[in-house]
Amino acid sequence: QRFAQAQQQLPLESLGWDVAELQLNHTGPQQDPRLYWQGGPALGRSFLHGPELDKGQLRIHRDGIYMVHIQVTLAICSSTTASRHHPTTLAVGICSPASRSISLLRLSFHQGCTIASQRLTPLARGDTLCTNLTGTLLPSRNTDETFFGVQWVRP
Amino acid sequence: QRFAQAQQQLPLESLGWDVAELQLNHTGPQQDPRLYWQGGPALGRSFLHGPELDKGQLRIHRDGIYMVHIQVTLAICSSTTASRHHPTTLAVGICSPASRSISLLRLSFHQGCTIASQRLTPLARGDTLCTNLTGTLLPSRNTDETFFGVQWVRP
Amino acid sequence: QRFAQAQQQLPLESLGWDVAELQLNHTGPQQDPRLYWQGGPALGRSFLHGPELDKGQLRIHRDGIYMVHIQVTLAICSSTTASRHHPTTLAVGICSPASRSISLLRLSFHQGCTIASQRLTPLARGDTLCTNLTGTLLPSRNTDETFFGVQWVRP
């Protein structure tokens, strides 16, 4: 009974339940391979509970091990499109602070139009995650085709 | 010590640990694109702890943010099969109540025989998730090739 | 306040937060399809908190339901490479104890160079997970392209 009461009294954030699910806002200017994300209940089913967006990039607020997941679908795409414009590659990484810059997750489209993956990785407060789409193909902005999220798993 | 005791005494369900992993039971009749799922220890490694099955579709019993994941493999498939019978698409969505109907996750097979993805999404008690496979290809019923599951992550 | 103190005093392991993320060490000798994994902070972003490695295979230390995830990318691969050397298949399963041997997750590469998936599955203390890559193609050892992990979800 005491535990249940305590659990209700503590804010969720203190339990370390940081979580975010983002939808694509837009791509960057021509020389910027980054995807720019947005989130919040007004936009549909995206949300940020703990992490924040900094100019369309996801910034972590709590140290811990996170499950990072992503799906990106190319717009109006067929296997022919994908193979003709190869290589198209998606990389998720820590892009700042620069001292912690590293690629966490990388996939190529080859003859497919969608990539989807996930991984566990340690992240620290202040880490900003960038998702770089290299190539000349535009990603779909449909919220069920392109999304990016993180879930705090443990300290 | 007190916390450990309290944790043991509280039923797991009260901690919000709803989780389910399902295996394919069968496809629907010709005009019904839904996949029908089954779960339970008697069937192998599938299970339902919290959510329930309603005529082969997964119904949520606890409000919260969930990780939804799915893998579907097409039966006796080669890249030739997949491309010849294109488009074959898998969509996971809330199909009832009708007021909350929305597509959560969508992938096409293109020249591949398997799709796999996952996403975080808010779900409410009573939401029923449907998995629609459009196209004319039969999915594999092997339990290591086709499966669908949800995991409660936080309120 | 009491709950917060108790949580800090208890070792994380007692909360059941077992988790591991591994990177590829090497492939097996010619007749051994298993991938051999490694993990630890000295190697980069891989880690083991609870599970252990036994000759490159992941051994579970706590009963429960786990989220198992994997991504494998083939080395210096194009869709032509993948299709010419088809079938290349990745299977994740319990390989010991022999009495519990079962395939949990299986994917073929077809014309793609990367497979990625995840599933929920019950695992028991002492279960050893093996990842078998059948075919003649070498997997990439890049840590952002090939990785394997588990996360304890609930008892």
Epitope: - | L24, Q30, T73, L74, A75, I76, C77, T81, S83, R84, H85, H86, G135, T136, L137, L138, P139, S140, R141, N142, T143, E145, T146 | -
Partner: antibody, heavy 120, light 111 residues
């Protein structure tokens, strides 16, 4: 109801080609595949090939060098052409609709058959 | 190619009795959680008619006295009780891989 109606010659000269048209009704050729199967007393039922909704074809390797299957969706017609016929190609030739599932390869509706004799 | 062997070649059976026809493949036709074996009925002067697909599923309009079973390499078609209109030749067909092949047929006759 679903129907497949075949039209084609009954007699073919040796080394000549055989052409059969299968006209379908009450289903779409853009959705369903159509198989060709032949039946002879000596060889029983033999699968020859199939054309899928998207226009792709799969052939029995034993016939691939002399068989062409094509179609015109707008006319609901499937065309079968086999070259270089010999006496042992004498058989009843059937077109048949593939069951709804494209990777099931069962044939749920059949044409009435075209009896073909190869003889000079 | 997968070879299908049907037995018996001819099966005399009395009205109301059970008819059992066997089909054996020289390699497994089961995959992906299904058995890719189908059964057809053919009457003289008519094309074959699909009875059962995926080893055990009755096609629409097929009477419930027909049933199929089996997996891997061994399959069975059962008819019970046999009726007069069941006099025909029955064929099995696999679809595990190309080329699709058929059994040589079993002729069901009334005693």
């Amino acid at each position: 109801q679903v129907q497949l109606k075949q039209s084609g010659p009954g007699l073919v000269q040796p080394s000549q080609s055989l052409s059969i048209t299968c006209t379908v009704s009450n289903f779409s050729l853009s959705t369903y595949g159509v198989h060709w199967v032949r039946q002879s007393p000596g060889k029983g039922l033999e699968w020859l090939g199939v054309i899928w909704g998207g226009g792709y074809t799969d052939y029995n390797a034993a016939f691939i060098s002399r068989l062409t299957i094509s179609k015109d969706n707008s006319k609901s017609q499937v065309f079968f052409k086999m070259n270089s016929l010999q006496a042992d190609d004498t058989a009843i030739y059937y077109c048949a609709r593939n069951n709804y599932y494209g990777n099931l390869y069962a044939m749920d509706y059949w044409g009435q058959g075209t009896s073909v004799t190869v003889s000079s | 190619d997968i070879v299908l062997t049907q037995s018996p070649a001819s099966l005399p059976v009395s009205l109301g009795q059970r008819a059992t026809i066997s089909c054996r493949a020289n390699k497994s036709v089961s995959a992906s959680g299904y058995s890719f074996m189908h059964w057809y009925q053919q009457k003289p002067g008519q094309p074959p008619k699909l009875l059962i697909y995926l080893a055990s599923n009755l096609d629409s309009g097929v009477p419930a006295r027909f049933s199929g079973s089996g997996s891997g390499t061994d399959f069975t078609l059962n008819i019970h009780p046999v009726e007069e209109e069941d006099t025909a030749t029955y064929y099995c067909q696999h679809s595990r891989e190309f080329p699709l092949t058929f059994g040589a047929g079993t002729k069901l006759e009334l005693k």
